[in-house]
């Protein structure tokens, strides 16, 4: 059973471009990740020249850096990318809207670049044990949430091919001796735990050897338990449109969420000339949902084609997961088709054909 | 209207099992979630955990972990808590009610089932 | 978890008196996640303030929620006979779900 009409509706409807300058937007994004904020002007108006500010300090564009006067997009984010993000009045200094980021290790799956560190002949005649790539050894310490996947690496080479083994708080580490077990990839000279758990936390080394040496790296794995929560909306989206009679619109919604989501898109609708039941719940309908054919990405965008007067009002992206759910709201103005497009571009974006 | 209505009063002995129902009627039961709450005599509300229908996956708070089990039957239109491992302090009523995501409350609730545990 | 603490935990007051309960959060909690509720010995709670300030359809006008970050007030604001009751603070901003331990407001 899909979302019938019978919904009510959020505290406060027109807080949708994202929080107010008191609220902080918690959001979270995995190392790699880009980092995409958004903070349309309130009211849909003019906002005049901004500036994008990261833990007090003025953010400067770079190639990875992407500042505009609404949207602040940083690229290949890094741990270091943490932190509060505010988008300021640059004449008076107010903060239009507040972001609190948190760039969480996302560990590759353990089975992305195999092949890329296998034993492979040196040409030295004898030697002991070498690390081949100690630029990819510098992180001693990997905190990552519960659940992901967590692969230690120690790639070596020496002659003979020296042999890899591992152990956990200075004892030899098998298979068995974790649920779901380990898989140790010799070639590629790795460790790789799935859906890590609490009680897989510690210190992990390898021991490379071979008849002439041993050397032996050790990490310190850190398992974070997850705070479950409900999906987080980016804020900012979906932004208020003002559109031409006859075009096409797009509704964009990004969703944040561990748990697998579920995301609806919902037009508020009047019944008997009243858009909120007697408890106060809304009256929609549901324009979008998933289904069997459509992909999470899908469901992020709403497409509105040959958009007519019956098109304008108000849309909501609806999206839940086993926490809980979470919605963001925006409001469609269609125009005539004769009103001058510079005009309407005050109010918000124009999508002309 | 919304209504959510619990199944009656039980007397259980320590160490047993207790299981309350909540039907709903006059709502879209799948796409909320339901919570439960009890109110040990005289005290406050402690939130144990819920359900959303169309996920199916319960959700429970640290302190009943393993002890509480809620499940959801969609075709009914009930939710079910199931306590265990009962102790002379699980005495106390026990509310089933319907979280509003559109305001993040719970605005409607059971009349509530009184659990009582004594030997 | 969230810890609301709410103050007084009894609170002695006539009839056309103003009440003021207030809720205090260990950490910031997005107003659009606190509720308040009424109960009444016997009864199941009932909803009175959504989303910090927005009033439960049904609800009095004398019943005035305000408050955000970690401070919130209920206020009521000429007391009748049928408000004397229990009243508790809720989040949801945060899992789990939490409630104030309540205050009481009674008869003087």
């Known amino acids: 059973e899909s979302l019938g009409t019978e919904q009510r509706v959020v505290g406060r409807a027109a807080e949708v471009p994202g929080p107010e300058p008191g609220q902080q937007e918690q959001l979270v994004f995995g190392s790699g990740d880009a980092v995409e904020l958004s903070c349309p002007p309130p009211g849909g108006g003019p906002m005049g020249p901004t500036v994008w500010v990261k833990d007090g300090t003025g953010l400067v564009p770079s190639e990875r850096v992407l500042v505009g006067p609404q949207r602040l997009q940083v690229l290949n984010a890094s741990h270091e990318d943490s932190g509060a993000y505010s988008c300021r009045q640059r004449l008076t200094q107010r903060v239009l809207c507040h972001f609190s980021v948190r760039v969480t290790d996302a560990p590759s799956s353990g089975d992305d670049e195999d092949g890329e560190d296998e034993a492979e002949d040196t040409g030295v005649d004898t030697g002991a044990p070498y690390w081949t790539r100690p630029e990819r050894m510098d992180k001693k310490l990997l905190a990552v949430p519960a659940a992901n996947t967590v692969r230690f690496r120690c790639p070596a080479a020496g002659n003979p091919t020296p042999s890899i083994s591992w152990l956990k708080n200075g004892r030899e580490f098998r298979g068995e001796h974790r649920i779901g077990g380990i898989k140790l990839r010799h070639q590629q000279w790795s460790l790789v735990m799935e859906s890590v758990v609490p009680s897989d936390r510690g210190n992990y080394t390898c021991v490379v050897e071979n008849k002439f040496g041993s050397i032996r790296q050790t990490y310190t794995l850190d398992v974070l338990e997850r705070s479950p929560h409900r999906p987080i909306l980016q804020a900012g989206l979906p932004a208020n449109q003002t559109a031409v009679l006859g075009s096409d619109v797009e509704f964009h919604c990004k969703v944040y969420s561990d748990a697998q989501p579920h995301i609806q898109w919902l037009k508020h609708v009047e019944v008997n000339g009243s858009k909120v039941g007697p408890d106060g719940t809304p009256y929609v309908t549901v324009l979008k949902t998933a289904g069997a054919n459509t992909t999470d990405k899908e469901l992020e965008v709403l497409s509105l084609h040959n958009v007519t007067f019956e098109d304008a009002g108000e849309y909501t992206c609806l999206a839940g997961n086993s926490i809980g759910f979470s919605h963001h709201s925006a409001w469609l103005v269609v125009l005539p088709a004769e009103e001058e497009l510079v005009e309407a571009d005050e109010a918000g974006s124009v999508y002309a054909g | 209207q919304v209504q959510l209505v619990q199944s009656g009063a039980e007397v259980k002995k320590p160490g047993s099992s207790v299981k309350v129902s909540c039907k709903a009627s006059g709502g879209t039961f799948s796409s909320y979630a339901i919570s439960w709450v009890r109110q040990a005599p005289g005290q406050g509300l402690e939130w144990m955990g819920g359900i959303i229908p169309i996920f199916g996956t319960a959700n429970y708070a640290q302190k009943f972990q393993g002890r509480v089990t809620i499940t959801a039957d969609e075709s009914t239109s009930t939710a079910y808590m199931e306590l265990s491992s009962l102790r002379s302090e699980d005495t106390a009523v026990y509310y089933c009610a319907r979280v509003n995501h559109w305001t993040y409350t719970f605005d409607y609730w059971g009349q509530g089932t009184l659990v009582t545990v004594s030997s | 978890d969230i810890v609301l603490t709410q103050s007084p935990a009894t609170l002695s007051l006539s009839p056309g008196e103003r009440a003021t309960l207030s809720c205090r959060a260990s950490q910031s909690v997005s107003s659009s996640y606190l509720a308040w509720y009424q109960q009444k010995p016997g009864q199941a709670p009932r909803l009175l303030i959504y989303g910090a300030s927005s009033r439960a359809t049904g609800v009095p006008a004398r019943f005035s929620g305000s408050g955000s970050g970690t401070d919130f007030t209920l206020t009521i604001s000429s007391l009748e006979p049928e408000d004397f009751a229990t009243y508790y603070c809720?989040?949801?901003?945060?899992?789990?779900?939490?409630f104030g331990q309540g205050t009481k407001v009674e008869i003087k």
């Open positions: 809720q989040q949801m901003s945060n899992y789990p779900d939490t």
